[in-house]
Every structure is written in structure tokens, then in C-alpha cells.
């Protein structure tokens, strides 16, 4: 038995920040779980982790230097990533593991979300400003 995950196919981070919502075919209420967001086709970089259980406040952390926060819904976890760089444009995968109560469950690999980071730009100067007037 596997949990199914739905994510937006693509998101654009205009201001170097983005909300990525991971929707699960499973209710996380009163479960102990570990939701994570992974970067790259091989999911090699664990961007952010949201750890939840019944007795503690939600724990959100990144061990890879990302600025992230997380919010929990009954069947979703939303990752809020800030201070993204243009070169962090990539595909991002949601992952979920439910440990308690048993049984242990994890998810079928999702299709992922391409996050396109658009850098902050100043107002562009016109390409052809025309002749300057005296």
C-alpha cells in the first residue's frame, strides 16, 4: 500500500520565494510522519523536512541550507521556500513517510514540480532609448 502524492507540474518563483503544496491520498491527523521535499531528478538533495507527531509542535528544518517553512493540513503539507537562487531552478519531489501508528507507509514517487526561479530584476533600461535631447 502506497500513499499517492499530487503536486503542481510547475511553479514560478518570481520573488525568489514559492509555496509548494504536497497533497496526499492520506489523512495525517494524529499520525507521526516525516514529510520532505527533494531537489533533482535523482532526489539527491533533501531541501526541507517537516516532522509531525501527536505530542509536539511541527518541526521544520533544512540540513542543506535552504530557507524553508512548512504548514500542515489534514491531507497536505505546504513547503514555503524563500531566498531561492536562479541556479536552483530544478524539479522538486514531495516525499511522505508515516511511521506511527503502524503500518509504516511511504509514497509512490510523484511526477514532481518544476520550480522556475526568476531572479529579482531592476526595471530594465530601454534597448533603444532614442536620441537624447539637448
Amino acid at each position: 500500500n502506497k500513499i499517492l502524492v499530487k503536486q503542481s507540474p510547475m511553479l514560478v518563483a518570481y520573488d525568489n520565494a514559492v509555496n509548494l503544496s504536497c497533497k496526499y491520498s492520506y489523512n495525517l491527523f494524529s499520525r507521526e510522519f516525516r514529510a520532505s521535499l527533494h531537489k533533482g531528478l535523482d532526489s539527491a538533495v533533501e531541501v526541507c523536512v517537516v516532522y509531525g507527531n501527536y505530542s509536539q509542535q511541527l518541526q521544520v528544518y533544512s540540513k542543506t541550507g535552504f530557507n524553508c517553512d512548512g504548514k500542515l493540513g489534514n491531507e497536505s503539507v505546504t513547503f514555503y521556500l524563500q531566498n531561492l537562487y536562479v541556479n536552483q531552478t530544478d524539479i522538486y519531489f514531495c516525499k511522505i513517510e508515516v511511521m506511527y501508528p503502524p503500518p509504516y507507509l511511504d509514497n509512490e514517487k510523484s511526477n514532481g514540480t518544476i520550480i522556475h526561479v526568476k531572479g529579482k530584476h531592476l526595471c530594465p533600461s530601454p534597448l533603444f532609448p532614442g536620441p537624447s535631447k539637448p
Epitope: 507521526e32 516525516r34 513517510e97 501508528p101 503502524p102 511511504d106
Partner: antibody, heavy 118, light 111 residues
Framework: QVQLVQSGAEVKKPGSSVKVSCKAS????????IHWVRQAPGQGLEWIGS???????YYSPSLKSRVTITADKSTSTAYMELSSLRSEDTAVYYC????????????WGQGTLVTVSS | DIQLTQSPSSLSASVGDRVTITCRAS??????????LHWYQQKPGKAPKLLIY???SLESGVPSRFSGSGSGTDFTLTISSLQPEDFATYYC?????????FGQGTKVEIK
């Protein structure tokens, strides 16, 4: 037949580490969670942690900073490493399989006695 | 952590006796209709052996004289007619919440 065979007894100095192995046979190792439990001499059972079929691990909060559980699917072997050993870690260490998915442990290794002594 | 308290800590009984061991959890171990409470038998120098899982399901190969009952916080292991090979220590275990915990054990001795 279905079995878990553990490595032999170890005598260790305080502050050192120990790594206990648990080799599975007779079942598809990669389909099951393996849990580790210890028992100090004359005492009850204490859960150490587990490794799930996905490769993810989960540890008892009291031992989390010192324990590492790993698995090698190619050899159907699980490992439990405990660092910064102290005398209170002297115990028989067991690996066990969770078959029903409810973390009830149906097959156990024979146990490995780890003695920590200076 | 969920505390499991077994009673009695030890008991003396004769072959053929009906023996009852109780296990009380510090909070409910039920979820979605399942009680995550399991019973083990351990003999000296041996690994524990699973007898009952999910409060009342008899493990394959375990004699039918062993039975488990209960839900919520109160559970019972019953041996309907004690046999010579049943003299051992019995443990309950909960797996509803982490960390997994065990009762302190009940030693069944020969009277």
C-alpha cells in the same frame, strides 16, 4: 527456513563503538522492517530503533544520538552500531522482523552479548 | 512515552492451572479499530517469542491455550491450562506510538 543470524559476542572498552550484524534468510529481506531491541542482564526489553524497507530509520529518543542502523539489501544484512559505549550498554542485542506491519516482532535473532568493561 | 504496567510481576502456578496476566497502558493504544498491543514469551538465555499480536490474534504455531483480550488501556494474556513448557517470563509490548515500549515482565514459576 525463516531466520535471523547475528554476529558473535563482543567485549568493548568504554567510549568505543560496536557494530552488530543480523543476516536474514528464508524471506525477502527488502520487504520487511527490522527492529533492534536490547536486554540488560536480568532486566526487561528496551527498543532501540528500526529500519524500514524504504531504508529509512527511526530511533528511540534515548539512544538517538549514539545509534545508527543500516542495511545492505545485497547481502540481506542489517547492522546496528552504537557509539560512545558505557557500562550501562552491556546487554544482549537482538534484531527482529516485523511481519504483520503492526510492529509485532515474529522472528528474532539469537542475540549478541555486548559487554562494556574497562 | 507510553508506560506498560504488568501484573503480577511474578506468580507461582501448577501444571493445569488457568493463568491470567494483565497489562495496563498509560494511555489508549487503539487506533482505527486495532489495538497495537502484543505479547511475548521469553525463556532464560533465549530470544523472546511472539505469542499474540494486535491484542487477540494468535501467532501461527502458538498453542491455542494462549489467548489475548482487551482494548484501550487494559489487556489480558490467558493460559487456559498451564503446561510444563510454559514456565517463562511474559512481556507485553505497545507499538501504537513511538518509542515502542515493553512491560516490565511477568515471571511464571512452578509452584
Amino acid at each position: 527456513q525463516v531466520q535471523l543470524v547475528q554476529s558473535g559476542a563482543e567485549v568493548k572498552k568504554p567510549g568505543s563503538s560496536v557494530k552488530v550484524s543480523c543476516k536474514a534468510s528464508g524471506f525477502t529481506f527488502s520487504s520487511y522492517a527490522i527492529h533492534w531491541v536490547r536486554q540488560a542482564p536480568g532486566q526487561g526489553l528496551e527498543w532501540i530503533g528500526s529500519i524500514y524497507h524504504s531504508g529509512s530509520t527511526y530511533y528511540s529518543p534515548s539512544l538517538k544520538s549514539r545509534v545508527t542502523i543500516t542495511a545492505d539489501k545485497s547481502t540481506s544484512t542489517a547492522y546496528m552500531e552504537l557509539s560512545s559505549l558505557r557500562s550501562e550498554d552491556t546487554a544482549v542485542y537482538y534484531c527482529a522482523r516485523d511481519v504483520y506491519g503492526s510492529y509485532a516482532l515474529d522472528v528474532w535473532g539469537q542475540g549478541t552479548l555486548v559487554t562494556v568493561s574497562s | 512515552d507510553i508506560q506498560l504496567t504488568q501484573s503480577p510481576s511474578s506468580l507461582s502456578a501448577s501444571v493445569g492451572d488457568r493463568v491470567t496476566i494483565t497489562c495496563r497502558a498509560s494511555q489508549s493504544v487503539d487506533f482505527d479499530g486495532i489495538s497495537f498491543l502484543h505479547w511475548y514469551q521469553q525463556k532464560p538465555g533465549k530470544a523472546p517469542k511472539l505469542l499474540i499480536y494486535d491484542a487477540s490474534s494468535l501467532e501461527s504455531g502458538v498453542p491455542s491455550r494462549f489467548s489475548g483480550s482487551g482494548s484501550g488501556t487494559d489487556f489480558t494474556l490467558t493460559i487456559s491450562s498451564l503446561q510444563p513448557e510454559d514456565f517463562a517470563t511474559y512481556y507485553c509490548q505497545q507499538s501504537y506510538r513511538s518509542p515502542i515500549t515493553f512491560g516490565q515482565g511477568t515471571k511464571v514459576e512452578i509452584k
